[in-house]
């Protein structure tokens, strides 16, 4: 089958980096410059990514394989492939329409990135604050009351999953 | 769960040193913290120090402030507890224990210290 799909459409046989020109009588020839082919048979080759402004080339482009960006320092990447770069704030703050902005209390972001998100409400797990909430961190819950009376069991069972409360205490 | 295990206790003399150690099966630092815990007989348990996995927070009983220390080892999957100054009153079962905010607390199996007079 690949015989006679070769010989019915010579472009089969260019290999990534090369695409088939029909101007030149369906011969392979190379990429130009600033482009790629990822795959055989391509009959043209697709314009590599540039990497400018807030975007930085975190992969060259190649003959093979499209450039790849990043963001420069102070900007994270959003979406598929880099698409977006969106700019950090510091932990403890979330990205609103008017800049970065602290946190409410009680609520926290313990990364440069995302929303604000409120502290555990350990009450709904029968447990207590251990160790208080902050803008960057999470309150901390201690052990259950059951776990600190005389004679508890030092190894507990595992428990099933469950998601922490979230609304703030 | 992960598995806890303490070790470093022992007896001692007042005014002595010890230094204990929580080693984890798993990684302890996915934890919200780690805590030591005591517990003398028919005594309640009772929280001797905390620290956040992150270790920017360290929390303290005030009966200990001043005297114990306690540390993320991340090479070793440990928190340690280091002990100075010690009194009678610090004889007990020391046990750590890492804290999930959702779900149940891993508790290790406890390290005896006694502190003589």
């Known amino acids: 089958f690949e015989r006679t799909r070769s010989l019915q459409d010579p472009c089969s046989n260019c290999p990534a980096g090369t695409f088939c020109d029909n101007n030149r009588n369906q011969i392979c020839s190379p990429c130009p410059p600033n482009s790629f082919s990822s795959a055989g048979g391509q009959r043209t080759c697709d314009i590599c990514r540039q990497c400018k402004g807030v975007f930085r080339t975190r992969k060259e482009c190649s003959s093979t394989s499209n450039a790849e960006c990043d963001c420069t320092p102070g900007f994270h990447c959003l979406g598929a492939g880099c698409s977006m770069c969106e700019q950090d704030c510091k932990q403890g703050q979330e990205l609103t329409k008017k800049g970065c902005k602290d946190c409410c209390f009680g609520t926290f972001n313990d990364q440069k990135r995302g929303i604000c998100r409120p502290w555990t409400n350990c009450s709904l797990d029968g447990k207590s604050v251990l160790v208080n909430g902050t803008k960057e961190r999470d309150v901390v819950c201690g052990p259950s009351p059951a776990d600190l009376s005389p004679g508890a069991s030092s190894v507990t069972p595992p428990a099933p999953a469950r998601e922490p409360g979230h609304s703030p205490q | 769960q992960v598995q806890l295990v303490e070790s470093g206790g022992g007896l001692v003399q007042a005014g002595g040193s010890l230094r204990l150690s929580c080693a984890a099966s798993g990684s302890i630092f996915s934890y919200n913290a780690v805590a030591w815990y005591r517990q003398a007989p028919g005594k309640q348990r009772e929280l001797v120090a905390v620290?956040?996995?992150?270790?920017?927070?360290?929390k303290y009983a005030d009966s200990v402030k001043g005297r114990f220390t306690i540390s993320r080892d991340i090479t070793k999957n440990a928190v340690d507890l280091q002990m100075v100054s010690l009194k009678p009153e610090d004889t007990a079962v020391y046990t750590c224990?890492?804290?999930?905010?959702?779900?149940?607390?891993?508790w290790g199996q406890g390290t005896q210290v006694t502190v003589s007079s």
């Open positions: 224990a890492a804290l999930r905010n959702s779900g149940s607390t891993s």
């Open positions: 620290i956040t996995s992150g270790g920017e927070t360290t």
